[in-house]
Interface confidence: low
Amino acid sequence: MHDSNNVEKDITPSELPANPGCLHSKEHSIKATLIWRLFFLIMFLTIIVCGMVAALSAIRANCHQEPSVCLQAACPESWIGFQRKCFYFSDDTKNWTSSQRFCDSQDADLAQVESFQELNFLLRYKGPSDHWIGLSREQGQPWKWINGTEWTRQFPILGAGECAYLNDKGASSARHYTERKWICSKSDIHV
């Protein structure tokens, strides 16, 4: 039931006085002040929420055209996300070159390890099996990542092979034709 004596219920936003002190009684003044503050707080929050929803909608709409603006990161099915990268851990085994070609077919590369956190994550996640990563070297040449950048000795690589893999302790190397599981990596996909 609408109570015409209840100012709190009667006041609409357009009827709020510019100065709440203009109300005659103290009780009405306090109520009007609270209503005024509450109204503007609700309006403020509504504007912020609406703005965020609109911004996110626009961002998501642009995801495919401008991936860099997308906020919500995701990885393809059967890929694992870690620190803005997606990793694929194979079940199959291949030689180093075929492993890289598999990664290439997925718009990825054999994993490039860029931090100790990433290395520890890969070592933890891959389990006990050896997995190829994207490091290789030509005879007498320094180790290089798949994209051609030189390896900066972030971790030791044991062995005398030309291609690197992760084992249960860290990194080692072997001939490219030996068969192992592999890890692909690529930048995360934004959706």
């Epitope: 030689n95 070159t97 075929s98 492993s99 890289q100 070609r101 054999l110 290789s136 798949i146 490219h176």
Partner: antibody, heavy 123, light 108 residues
Amino acid sequence: QVTLKESGPTLVKPTQTLTLTCTFSGFSLSTSGVGVGWIRQPPGKALEWLALIYWDDDKRYSPSLKSRLTITKDTSKNQVVLTMTNMDPVDTATYYCAHRLDSSGRGGYFDYWGQGTLVTVSS
Amino acid sequence: ETTLTQSPGTLSLSPGERVSLSCRASQNVYSNFLAWYQQRPGQAPSLLIYGASSRAAGVPDRFSGSGSGTDFALTISRVEPEDFAVYYCQQYGTSPITFGQGTRLEIK
């Protein structure tokens, strides 16, 4: 010494299927890293990559022609076969096969080429 | 797909001159996986340069390759009569493999 030689019909009618064979020597298509590719060149025009097959039977095709191409290998005969369906006069070109050593996992350059075979598509 | 644009289309010069041919990619060529080929009239292409700057076996040292990213060049320090031919660049860093449209080197 690596050699490659293309063979197949010199004249094909529109809508027919072209079958080309590349017979090679001096390398084995069972050796890790080895691939054989097909490239074509219309008269007076640029080179266009068509297809590629690797020692492990991995196959790659040009996206624009993928639906029309099939590449296969016969390791024992040292042969690679390319078939191209629904031939059209615009497919008139010299067709080359070439050897490729993929040591990077991202493919490689073509270091040995066949002499090429001119295929004319006309009714 | 990576589009390769070669310039100029045709180049007229005399034997003994130095020449640079340009190959520009529409996007970075992955790990500078770019090759140059020479094609003489009526012959198949032959590999000159791979990896942007490495000379293939048997290629005279007057041929050199340079560049990275999107801009590459093939330089012939002193053009010999047998060098008059068409030159193609090719990228093999990303699928599909693509070739440039070629630069024809002709005698002035």
